[in-house]
């Protein structure tokens, strides 16, 4: 029988500095493509090696992307999604929450729907 | 850490056909889109088709937008198994141009950065494709 597994949650403020190649991640999500489970909300899916993001070191693939530059991301269709980030300047101020997968007990088992790791 | 592994490739003769496989393995949360290119000896990696991937509340869904170069149209079909996170690649009324080194590679999302159409997350190791 597996384990219980719980998550750690926390929210951190990230400020980026738009490299030369950009700011250096991909992202999925958007009330279009819900990537999690009852969540339409924006994910981290991909950290470019060398980019701004990783660099950085702060943001990880599976973080969830509240905010960038104050404005909300909640509801906003995919590629409504990539055009802010595209269109937000050299310093970009990004509200990120972070899930940490916490073990309790055996082994438990992550659907593939879930963005930790 | 996301890996790839290609197969399927061969020797056959003109007309015939081969299915390649490309299995992924590791995370697959944000997988957006697959895809196969090709290389040919002494040319540039081209593009030979893609298939998104449809997620649906936090589950892969079939049939996802596909995309064939001109040069292959009506002859290969891209297609997908989501249980078994593998895209295959059925090649039909294969020709000699056809031989090159076949790649599979996967697309995680959307970039936030202006990016170049083949600018793909992932590759797989290549599987050879011979028509004679």
């Known amino acids: 029988m597996n384990g219980r597994v719980d998550y750690l949650v926390t929210e951190e403020e990230i400020n980026l500095t738009r490299g030369p190649s950009g700011l250096g991640f991909n992202i999925v999500g958007g009330t279009d493509q819900q990537y999690v489970s009852n969540d339409s909300g924006i994910y981290v899916s991909r950290i470019k090696e060398n980019g701004a993001a990783a660099l950085d070191g702060r943001l990880q693939e599976g973080d969830k992307i509240l905010s960038v530059n104050g404005q909300d991301l909640k509801n906003l269709l995919h590629q409504d999604a990539v055009d802010l980030f595209r269109n937000a300047g050299y310093a970009v101020s990004l509200r990120v929450q972070h899930r940490l997968q916490v073990q309790n007990g055996p082994i438990g088992h992550r659907g593939e729907g879930d963005p930790s790791g | 850490e996301v890996q790839l592994v290609e197969s399927g490739g061969g020797l056959v003769q003109a007309g015939g056909s081969l299915r390649l496989s490309c299995a992924a393995s590791?995370?697959?949360?944000?997988?957006?889109?697959m895809g196969w290119f090709r290389q040919a000896p002494g040319k540039e990696r081209e593009l030979v088709s893609t298939?998104?991937?449809?997620?649906?509340?936090?589950?892969?869904?079939?049939?996802?937008?596909?995309h064939y170069a001109d040069s292959v149209k009506g002859r290969f079909t891209i297609s997908r198994d989501d249980a078994k996170n593998t895209v295959y690649l059925q090649m039909d009324s294969l020709k000699p141009e056809d031989t090159a080194l076949y790649y599979c590679?996967?697309?995680?999302?959307?970039?936030?950065?202006?990016?170049?159409?083949?600018?793909?997350?992932?590759w797989g190791q290549g599987t050879q494709v011979t028509v004679s």
């Open positions: 590679a996967a697309r995680f999302g959307s970039s936030v950065d202006v990016i170049i159409p083949d600018d793909y997350d992932y």
């Open positions: 590791g995370r697959t949360f944000g997988m957006s889109t």
């Open positions: 298939i998104s991937i449809i997620w649906r509340d936090g589950r892969t869904q079939s049939g996802g937008r596909t």
